[in-house]
Every structure is written in structure tokens, then in C-alpha cells.
Amino acid sequence: EEELQVIQPDKSVLVAAGETATLRCTATSLIPVGPIQWFRGAGPGRELIYNQKEGHFPRVTTVSDLTKRNNMDFSIRIGNITPADAGTYYCVKFRKGSPDDVEFKSGAGTELSVRAKPSAPVVSGPAARATPQHTVSFTCESHGFSPRDITLKWFKNGNELSDFQTNVDPVGESVSYSIHSTAKVVLTREDVHSQVICEVAHVTLQGDPLRGTANLSETIRVPPTLEVTQQPVRAENQVNVTCQVRKFYPQRLQLTWLENGNVSRTETASTVTENKDGTYNWMSWLLVNVSAHRDDVKLTCQVEHDGQPAVSKSHDLKVSAHPKEQGSNTAAENTGSNERNIY
């Protein structure tokens, strides 16, 4: 009878993570008597995967009944495959012996490759908000995929971005890989409703890429524009001055009225109106009793937006055109939550 050969018919096997891998092995002879063992890797550091003779291998099942003498099929199944199981598996026949069994013949090996899906991409933006015309960086990360080949694209509102850098780690062979990409995005005043999307395509996703998103509303700060105007006289001695705060984002805003440099009133933006582009408008007004003033009044609308240094706009109120009532030093009554008389 010809000498036993160990046949591993599959040079390679590709399995999706979580599935079961079948590693095939047959012997050409029933002689010599002795156990079969499966190893991952070769040489002294090889890892025992299954021993026909003894041991507990909960993830491994045999395809046929290995307890029987007439069995020549030593194929095994390994359940719940993970990327860590990737490697070359050898089916090795031993000859029965004492004190130890003697390695007799090895199969040529079967390379197990594991297809593992990438994790959902996580997109993160800058720690601090930035204003339009500035360039900000977004990062996208995805982990745990195999094989290494992967495609990553960036989009802003459906338009593909080109200014990005991507790395896949590690560079060498590994059981699984990670991707890290940084994209540069130039902000515009219209970006409050914009989204940045990181799209990852991989062989395991069957043409249905994974996406991670970041809302530019978390990143952008649109500073307000201010306009102070004097409204027509409401009464003989009263002037209504308004401060229009336009096109700002986010909503966090505090307004202070100054009369000749002195704080008159401070208020926080509450009842704002939203523009189509997602920015906000707000208006504050003052009712000024001009008869309380001998000289011209410099009214300043000072706005602190989102913790940034204050911006302001001033308006000179001419008093000379309004004759004062003798002995009058009382202000007109407030007529609204954001109306204030100036004495």
C-alpha cells in the first residue's frame, strides 16, 4: 500500500465574520494508526486548533466521525469566525507512539481569510466653532474590517470633496484594519443646514456603503450684522430706536444698550426668527424720552455672540430738534419687554 498522503484540497477559504469555516482534509490511507491534529501556522510557535485524541475545542466540530478507524476524512468546521482566526491551517497526521505520538505527514495548508465588515464610520469635527471663509478639518474613522482594500469618500451636501487624506492601518499584514481620513472643508454663511458625509465602501457591504455624518450646525458660527435705526417719533418727546441683529448662528446671543457709554439694559435673545438658511434674526428696541436730555445722545447696541468678543453699532440721537419740557425729568412708561426709557 502506498504511503499515506494528507490532502488539503483548498488552497484558500474565504469566510465572512460570524460564519462557519469548513477546512477540508483527507488521508489517502488508514495506515499508520494515529491521531490527526489541526494547527494554525507552522513551526514551533504553531497554535493547536483541534486534537482528535484529547482536549476541549468548543468552536470546532468534525465533518465525519473521527472516532472510527475506517475514517479518512479529517475535515473540521470552526464556528463564529472572527478576523483573529485568519491564517494558514495545517492538517497533520501523527503516528501512534509512546511516550508521545510522532508527527508523520502534514497537509499543504489552507489559508483562511476572513471578511469582516467595517464599523459604522464616526465623523468628528473641530472642537471649537469657526466662521465662514475659514477652513475646518473633519475626521472619519472606521475599524475592524478585512480584507484591507477599502474606499472612502467625502461629501458636502451631496457634492464630493477632494481635499482629504486617508490612511489604512496597519500597513503590513493584520487580522483586521482601520481607516482614518481627514477632510478640509471651507465654511460659507449658508452652511448651517449643511452636512458633511463620510462614505465607506467595502467588499463585505455588497454595494451598500456605510455613512457617517456631521452637521455643520455643530461647527459653524455665523457672526451677526447689526443695524441701529431711529424710528419715527411715537409721541412728542419719545423716539424709538431699534437694533436689528441679523443672520447669526448659533442662537446664543446677549445684547446690551449703552447710552453715552453707560449700560442701559442687557438682554438675551429669546424670541428669534429663523431664516431659510438656518441663521437667526432678532430685534431689540429702546423708547427714548428725548426731553430728559440736554445734549445729543450716543446710543450703542453691543452684541456678544456665542461667547465671542462683543461687536457694536452706534447711533447718534439729535436732541436739539426736540424742545424740552421745563422741569421734566421723568421717563415715559415702558411699553414692552424690550423697551426702555433713557432719563
Partner: antibody, heavy 118, light 107 residues
Framework: EVQLVESGGGLVQPGGSLRLSCAAS????????MHWVRQTTGKGLEWVSV???????YYAGSVKGRFTISRENAKSSLYLQMNSLRAGDTAVYYC????????????WGQGTMVTVSS | DIQMTQSPSSLSASVGDRVTITCRAS??????LAWFQQKPGKAPKSQIY???SLQSGVPSKFSGSGSGTDFTLTISSLQPEDFATYYC?????????FGQGTKLEIK
């Protein structure tokens, strides 16, 4: 059903010969090593001989040169030719299948009695 | 030849008892050791092979352990049908050899 049935035992004079047979059924006979084991009355078990799948043979020292094991795969039969029999060969003779992967015996026949006496 | 020594040669026990029989080889036999049960007038019946593997159809109350030269057979809860003679056998190298047997009797 897997079965082994021995035959050919009997009374024989010292120096005489006897041929034991073991008929196998219910399995692929050619794929197993086959053994003979004997048990003297009231005594323990003694392994006698084996014939491997490829026809290789081994014997216990006490029977070497006197006993010959053989097999006929086409008939699923095992044989033990016993020559120059001695009183010490008196025993129940069992055939056994090396049915486990490691050649451990898994199936035994019911045995056949061999008595060597004048 | 490898000598196999069993102890004790006889053992009295009661139904429900846990019993252990030991077998020692005169040299290292790896774990190529089998245990057989034999009742009067019957052929031996395989219980355990490769020191600890249960033969198909044998109840799990039987267990074996050991490697090298020292081996044990344990029956966890004796039933009336378990009273018999038990033999160990090394099948590491030819000639295969048996122990002299342990007779397990009802107390």
C-alpha cells in the same frame, strides 16, 4: 448490525492443529485492523495476534512461530491457524475489531472454546 | 513487554457508591489505555479508550483519566448492572497487554 461470530473451536490433542474463523458483518471489513484475544478459564485476558489493514501481522511471544493470522477481505473473514498446540493454549478465543481511530477494540465476538488435551 | 498492574484485584461496594479502579503501566504508554467490562460467560465490552474517551453507548457515569503510566476508572454511582470484572489494556505498542482484572462485587 455490526457483528463478529467466531467458529472452529473444539477439542484437540497436544501438538495438533486447529483453524479458527471469525465472520464479520455490518461493516467494511477491509478498513479495520482485526485481533485475536484469548481467555483461559477463570483467568485474565491475553492478546494473541493482529492483522492490519495492509496485511501486516504481529504476535504475542507465547504463540509466535506456531500461530498464523490471516484475513480474506472479500469474504469479510478473519482466521487463526493454530499449530503445535499445547495445553497452555486452552482458552476461549475472541476476535475483536480495532474499531476506534487509535485501534482500540470496540466490538468483540462471543468467543469460541479451544481445549487442548489428550 | 509492557506489564499492566491493576488494583485492587477485588472490590466490594454498594449500589449508589462511587468506586475507583487504578491501573499502572510498567512504562509510558502515552494515553493508549482502554477499559473493558466483562460479566460471567460473556465477551468483554469496551467502556473507555484513549484513557478518557467514552465508547459509544456507554453511560456517562463511567469516566477515565490519566496519561503516561498511571490511570483510573471511576464509576460515579454504582447500579446492579455495573457489578462485573474490569480490565485495563495498553494498546500503545505490540504486544498489547491486559491487566489481571478487578472484580467488583456487591457488598
Amino acid at each position: 448490525e455490526v457483528q463478529l461470530v467466531e467458529s472452529g473451536g473444539g477439542l484437540v490433542q497436544p501438538g495438533g492443529s486447529l483453524r479458527l474463523s471469525c465472520a464479520a458483518s455490518g461493516f467494511t471489513f477491509s478498513s479495520y485492523d482485526m485481533h485475536w484475544v484469548r481467555q483461559t478459564t477463570g483467568k485474565g485476558l491475553e492478546w494473541v495476534s493482529v492483522i492490519g489493514i495492509a496485511g501486516d501481522t504481529y504476535y504475542a511471544g507465547s504463540v509466535k512461530g506456531r500461530f498464523t493470522i490471516s484475513r480474506e477481505n472479500a469474504k469479510s473473514s478473519l482466521y487463526l491457524q493454530m499449530n503445535s498446540l499445547r495445553a497452555g493454549d486452552t482458552a476461549v478465543y475472541y476476535c475483536a475489531r480495532g474499531g476506534n481511530w487509535d485501534d482500540a477494540f470496540d466490538i468483540w465476538g462471543q468467543g469460541t472454546m479451544v481445549t487442548v488435551s489428550s | 513487554d509492557i506489564q499492566m498492574t491493576q488494583s485492587p484485584s477485588s472490590l466490594s461496594a454498594s449500589v449508589g457508591d462511587r468506586v475507583t479502579i487504578t491501573c499502572r503501566a510498567s512504562q509510558d504508554i502515552n494515553n493508549y489505555l482502554a477499559w473493558f467490562q466483562q460479566k460471567p460467560g460473556k465477551a468483554p465490552k469496551s467502556q473507555i479508550y484513549t484513557a478518557s474517551s467514552l465508547q459509544s453507548g456507554v453511560p456517562s457515569k463511567f469516566s477515565g483519566s490519566g496519561s503516561g503510566t498511571d490511570f483510573t476508572l471511576t464509576i460515579s454511582s454504582l447500579q446492579p448492572e455495573d457489578f462485573a470484572t474490569y480490565y485495563c489494556q495498553q494498546y500503545s505498542t505490540y504486544p498489547y497487554t491486559f491487566g489481571q482484572g478487578t472484580k467488583l462485587e456487591i457488598k
